[in-house]
């Protein structure tokens, strides 16, 4: 132990400690609860949740989606490929979660919690992943210009973008949860 430091071990009692899989599962469910809270405000504030004009806004977005080739579905399931996809997807969602930070009035704290808990989930998954080389981190410059572009949209498009981000993130996490339960 370095000087000026004092390391104190916490010993495990008789109960079973949380496993990596259990804790990741709980973390995803934590984020999903956060998304539900945010969606509640979004849907109460505007009629975006019932809107049929989603395609207009979706053209501006390149939100991560699970595809057959990612190996996360029951048919053609591949643990390594899927884990890489989940981590890569979460890293890609980070810029959109940053965009959400100024989009909520009464749920500002919840929006921050969703953003931070996603960062924590990435940490947990990166420890679980063996093939870290295959994980590409989004380019900060590209993210910065995307953020500027999203923030420059008119009010209706910003509301629609918020709705689409939350919906897509929820779907991505639900797919991830199902896949991780097979690992």
């Amino acid at each position: 132990v370095p000087p000026g430091e004092d390391s104190k071990d916490v010993a495990a009692p008789h109960r079973q400690p949380l496993t990596s899989s259990e804790r990741i599962d709980k973390q995803i469910r934590y984020i999903l609860d956060g998304i539900s809270a945010l969606r509640k405000e979004t849907c109460n504030k505007s009629n975006m949740c019932e809107s049929s004009k989603e395609a207009l806004a979706e053209n501006n977005l390149n939100l991560p989606k699970m595809a057959e080739k990612d190996g996360c579905f029951q048919s053609g399931f591949n643990e390594e490929t899927c884990l890489v996809k989940i981590i890569t997807g979460l890293l890609e969602f980070e810029v959109y979660l940053e965009y959400l930070q100024n989009r909520f009035e009464s749920s500002e704290e919840q929006a921050r919690a969703v953003q931070m808990s996603t960062k924590v989930l990435i940490q947990f998954l990166q420890k679980k992943a063996k093939n870290l080389d295959a994980i590409t981190t989004p380019d900060p410059t590209t993210n910065a210009s995307l953020l500027t572009k999203l923030q420059a949209q008119n009010q209706w498009l910003q509301d629609m973008t918020t709705h689409l981000i939350l919906r897509s993130f929820k779907e991505f996490l639900q797919s991830s949860l199902r896949a991780l339960r097979q690992m």
Epitope: V10, P17, Y30, D33, Q110, A113
Partner: nanobody
């Protein structure tokens, strides 16, 4: 463990776990001064990294996580004689429900695991 520090000095306490991963748990730091009740001074959640500090240590103490080492540290600066006591770290899962109250982390929340404590003495 712990140590003798002069007033105004600094000390860093580090909490590690044996038999489980501390990364997955909310961690609180508590202290017990001679003849006094144990008091919660700081905590950090595992779910969204929210932190809390008791008024007595706010601005002087900093709690942080290190995922590489799976530890939680308490950096204590500008130490005062009244900071003297036995310091304990504890780990729990009270932060796993969205909307938990961070300020309750040093009081009403349950902790599953407790460290054995280390003596910190601030004196000239």
């Amino acid at each position: 463990g712990g140590g003798l520090v002069q007033p105004g000095g600094s000390l860093r306490l580090s909490c590690a776990a044996s038999g489980f991963t501390l990364d997955y748990y909310a961690v609180g730091w508590f202290r017990q001064a001679p003849g006094k009740e144990r008091e919660g001074i700081s905590c950090i959640s595992s779910s969204d990294l929210k932190t809390y500090y008791a008024d007595s240590v706010k601005g002087r103490f900093t709690i942080s996580r290190d995922y590489a080492k799976s530890t939680v540290s308490l950096q204590m600066n500008s130490l005062k004689p009244e900071d003297t006591g036995v310091y304990y770290c504890a780990a729990g899962t009270w932060d796993l429900k969205f909307g938990y109250n961070i300020s309750a982390c040093v009081g009403s929340y349950e902790y599953d695991y407790w460290g054995q404590g280390t003596q910190v003495t601030v004196s000239s």
